[in-house]
């Protein structure tokens, strides 16, 4: 008799999981030497005890902490790009900066990056049909509890001037209920940082308007004033120029506003 | 078993380009950062730089930087090393190589390599 | 860069004979040094990774040893097989280096 199965709403786990995690590893410490020291294998294991015979919507940010201690990784704490709803242009930017770092340019972030996982309670099998969605299902779902645990640690890490790449093409450009809304923002050091500097993306070509005045971003500010940490917002009017202009600073036409 | 395998040998005028394809097979070709080494003739290897092929991430070695543009097409599962404004000093053998999983961050698997003459 | 400094650059010995090549980084690579030998017309082929472990298949007479910045690489008994260029390389931080190679013949 075929056992029954918990049908959630959302996406199963991402198909090779287990083989893309161990594959992401290998080359994440090939590509940064200076993590050498991890033990890809120990990596997986850990990855996999923080969901695997657990309920789906039962998994806490303490199930993870083994993979977060092996995990840890010391990045420029000046150096901290957030962004919210712009995922692809924040990571062209620091491919581009490479003094910079997204979450996804750390270890951790990169293992999971676009990844769907979950496992069944009392059993050792990856739930590959589905996953707990989280709006439809419950929230503490094993993606949803990793990306809030990452994220913490890492606006907790954040100093000096940190940026957020924010998606003026969205209706609430700054949202509450995203994961740099309801987690990041949140969890900036006001003893460490100083200001938030907000660079909102514009997405049209004729598109002028100042959106720095946009009432989310005034949001953004009060919440951020709050934690009496500073706020500053630029335009990025051109994002292809902007990008163009990081990668050749000394371009003639990177003087003027991009 | 893990393959690569290189084009053809090409040859090609000063400031012409180079492009230069490595076609993987027994692995999934995003599970592996793609490196490319050159080799001049009856000389010692120089490491070129690397793709990761999965986000199209690269690392090219200053000396390079500006001329050499690293590409994966992981539909064909074939990664690509085009070498621009060529010049006679970029005669060599071109080879792509990956580690693996018992070997550090040696490189156990090697394509066959793939001649380039840059002569007028 | 770090410089990969091999000697000697050629060596001519006889069956049987031991043989040894050394590489000195120009910093600490830790014990990330691998080594390849390379036959004319082929492409490299890696005989030791990080510093001492015999990649797999390959004949125990082929060994390395070292650390930090000296490094030795040793066939124990030389086969005419053995005929090849080796090279070393460090791992251990970007760009890559080899070091310029070691030509071994038999007399």
């Known amino acids: 008799v075929p056992r029954w199965r918990q049908q959630w709403s959302g996406p199963g786990t991402t198909k090779r999981f287990p083989e893309t995690v161990l594959a992401r590893c290998v080359k994440y410490t090939e590509i940064h030497p200076e993590m050498r020291h991890v033990d890809c294998q120990s990596v997986w294991d850990a990855f996999k005890g923080a969901f695997i015979s657990k309920h789906p919507c039962n998994i806490t940010e303490e199930d993870y902490q083994p993979l977060m201690k092996l995990g840890t990784q010391t990045v420029p704490c000046n150096k901290i790009l957030l962004w919210s709803r712009i995922k692809d242009l924040a990571h062209q930017f620091t491919q581009v900066q490479r003094d910079m770092f997204t979450l996804e340019d750390t270890l951790l972030g990169y293992l999971a990056d676009d990844l769907t996982w979950c496992g069944e309670f009392n059993t050792s099998k990856i739930n590959y049909q589905s996953c707990p969605d989280w709006r439809k299902d419950c929230s503490n779902n094993p993606v949803s509890v990793f990306w809030k645990t990452v994220s913490r640690r890492f606006a907790e890490a954040a100093c000096d001037v940190v940026h957020v790449m924010l998606n003026g093409s969205r209706s609430k450009i700054f949202d509450k209920n995203s994961t740099f809304g309801s987690v990041e923002v949140h969890n900036l050091q006001p003893e460490k940082v100083q200001t938030l500097e907000a660079w909102v993306i514009h997405g049209g070509r004729e598109d002028s308007r100042d959106l720095c005045q946009d009432p989310t971003i005034k949001e953004l500010e009060s919440i951020i004033s709050k934690r009496n940490i500073q706020f500053s917002c630029k335009n990025i009017y051109r994002p292809d120029k902007f990008l163009q202009c990081v990668k050749n600073p000394e371009d003639s036409s990177c003087t003027s506003e991009i | 078993q893990v393959q690569l395998v290189q084009s053809g040998a090409e040859v090609k005028k000063p400031g012409a380009s180079v492009k230069v394809s490595c076609k993987v097979s027994?692995?999934?070709?995003?599970?592996?950062?793609m490196n490319w080494v050159r080799q001049h003739p009856g000389k010692g290897l120089e490491w070129m730089g690397w793709?990761?092929?999965?986000?199209?991430?690269?690392d090219v070695a200053q000396k390079f930087q500006g001329r050499v543009t690293m590409t994966a097409d992981t539909s064909t599962d074939t990664a690509y090393m085009e070498l621009s404004s060529l010049r006679s000093e970029d005669t060599a053998v071109y080879y792509c190589?990956?580690?693996?999983?018992?070997?550090?961050?040696?490189?156990?698997?090697w394509g066959q390599g793939t001649t380039v003459t840059v002569s007028s | 860069d770090i410089q990969m400094t091999q000697s000697p650059s050629s060596l001519s010995a006889s069956v049987g004979d031991r043989v040894t090549i050394t590489c000195q980084a120009s910093?600490?690579?830790?014990?990330?040094v691998d080594w390849y030998q390379q036959k004319p017309g082929k492409a490299p082929k890696l005989l030791i990774y990080?510093?001492?472990n015999r990649y797999t298949g390959v004949p125990s007479r082929f060994s390395g040893s070292g650390s930090g910045t000296d490094f030795t690489f040793t066939i124990s008994s030389l086969q005419p097989e053995d005929i090849a260029t080796y090279y070393c390389?460090?791992?251990?931080?970007?760009?890559?280096?080899f070091g310029g190679g070691t030509k071994v013949e038999i007399k």
């Open positions: 190589a990956r580690t693996g999983y018992n070997s550090g961050y040696g490189f156990p698997y």
């Open positions: 027994g692995y999934t070709l995003t599970d592996s950062v």
């Open positions: 793709i990761d092929p999965e986000y199209g991430r690269t």
């Open positions: 910093q600490n690579v830790d014990s990330d």
């Open positions: 990080k510093a001492s």
């Open positions: 390389a460090q791992s251990n931080t970007h760009p890559r280096t």
